[in-house]
């Protein structure tokens, strides 16, 4: 028979032969013959391979140092590479997370929008008119103005993105 | 029948080498891998390393830097050497046959004599 | 690399009573993939060379008699002989056949009262 061109899935061809691949986890040690199975062998501690291979080394599991403020998520397994996170207060600067950066605080006159996680900055946004934030905050939002009526006083001093409203109690009509 | 056959030195000078062939019969090198593993009072049973059927190598990492094995297909022989031996490699060295029996699953199924390996001036 | 610990290091049967013998591993034997456990059972009986009993945890050697049981999963394994004969009498080693460098452990001496 014409030796193939084309091998089978979970299958590679070398010297005019289909071998089988190494399944997720093992690596190859002896590429199959006529007479003989590909030969396998699991990754060591530490190690990985995510697919059907013909590797020979397999790969290191990602190191999540905690000097760039890492942390494991999820531990890895002979089949699946380790997910790092940052730190509480810290977000991953892309989405490898190969590093992290501290959380954005919204400045006075911004409130949270969106409170980080590991994997995403603080989104900010702007205090609407009747709204005020007087810190720099990564967890505040905007608050409400006070209501002087429902205390029963007036406004004295009109609030800003950044300053609530004073309020003061109402002028006396004199006798 | 399967048969593994060493030969070598029973004695050998500190920091020099130790060579030792394994002849086999009943079997191909092409097509089983062949193991090196010593035994010594203090340290039980070390596996120190392996020449797979296709003639790529493993070895302990604690042995890497000293030890060479290499094969003779043809001859159906493998070649063990470790250089700079001191007292604690005082050992009895085996050869023995790889076993594969799928998932990634090895063992060794035979063995050879052994030779017993005495380091001292 | 994996430490494999074995107990007791020695133990004595009279002929006809069932011996355990434990081993434990440092790391976990069992791949995830395959569901498999990749712990080997030699026996080396007095000025001899190691035997192949067991692979696999629990898959015996052709030739070696059933009377040789292995089981186990994860770190903790167990070589079990369910009516111990004279012929019997040796050192027994488990060794994770897991990955390289493969390790053995220290053996259990097996001694016929």
């Known amino acids: 028979p014409e030796p193939p061109t084309a091998c089978r899935e979970k299958q590679y061809l070398i010297n005019s032969q289909c071998c089988s691949l190494c399944q997720p986890g093992q690596k190859l040690v002896s590429d199959c013959t006529e007479f003989t199975e590909t030969e396998c062998l699991p990754c060591g501690e530490s190690e990985f391979l995510d697919t059907w291979n013909r590797e020979t080394h397999c790969h290191q599991h990602k190191y999540c140092d905690p000097n760039l403020g890492l942390r494991v998520q999820q531990k890895g397994t002979s089949e699946t590479d380790t997910i790092c996170t940052c730190e509480e207060g810290w977000h991953c600067t892309s989405e490898a997370c190969e590093s992290c950066v501290l959380h954005r605080s919204c400045s006075p006159g911004f409130g949270v929008k969106q409170i980080a996680t590991g994997v995403s900055d603080t989104i900010c946004e702007p205090c609407p008119v009747g709204f005020f934030s007087n810190v720099s905050s990564a967890f505040e939002k905007c608050h409400p103005w006070t209501s002087c009526e429902t205390k029963d006083l007036v406004v004295q001093q009109a609030g800003t993105n950044k300053t609530d409203v004073v309020c003061g109690p109402q002028d006396r009509l004199r006798a | 029948q399967v048969q593994l056959k060493q030969s070598g030195p029973g004695l050998v000078q500190p920091s020099q080498s130790l060579s030792i062939t394994c002849t086999v019969s009943?079997?191909?090198?092409?097509?089983?891998?062949l193991h090196w593993v010593r035994q010594s009072p203090g340290k039980g049973l070390e596996w120190l390393g392996v020449?797979?059927?296709?003639?790529?190598?493993d070895y302990n990492a604690a042995f890497m830097s000293r030890l060479s094995i290499t094969k003779d297909n043809s001859k159906s022989q493998v070649f063990f050497k470790m250089n700079s031996l001191q007292a604690d490699d005082t050992a009895i060295y085996y050869c023995?046959?790889?076993?594969?029996?799928?998932?990634?699953?090895?063992?060794?199924?035979?063995w050879g004599q052994g030779t017993s390996v005495t380091v001292s001036s | 690399d994996i430490v494999m610990t074995q107990s007791p290091s020695s133990l004595a049967m009279s002929v006809g009573q069932k011996v355990t013998m434990s081993c434990k591993s440092s790391q976990s034997l069992l791949h995830s993939f395959n569901q498999k456990n990749y712990l080997a059972w030699y026996q080396q009986r007095p000025g001899q060379s190691p035997k192949l009993l067991i692979y696999?945890?629990?898959t015996r050697e052709s030739g070696v008699p059933d009377r040789f049981l292995g089981s186990g999963s994860g770190t903790d394994f167990t070589l079990t002989i369910s009516s111990v004969q004279a012929e019997d009498l040796a050192d027994y080693f488990c060794q994770q056949h897991y990955t390289t460098p493969f390790t053995f452990g220290s053996g259990t001496k097996l001694e016929i009262k």
């Open positions: 696999f945890t629990s």
């Open positions: 023995a046959k790889n076993s594969y029996y799928g998932n990634g699953g090895h063992a060794m199924d035979y």
């Open positions: 009943g079997f191909s090198l092409t097509t089983y891998g």
């Open positions: 020449i797979w059927r296709g003639g790529n190598t």
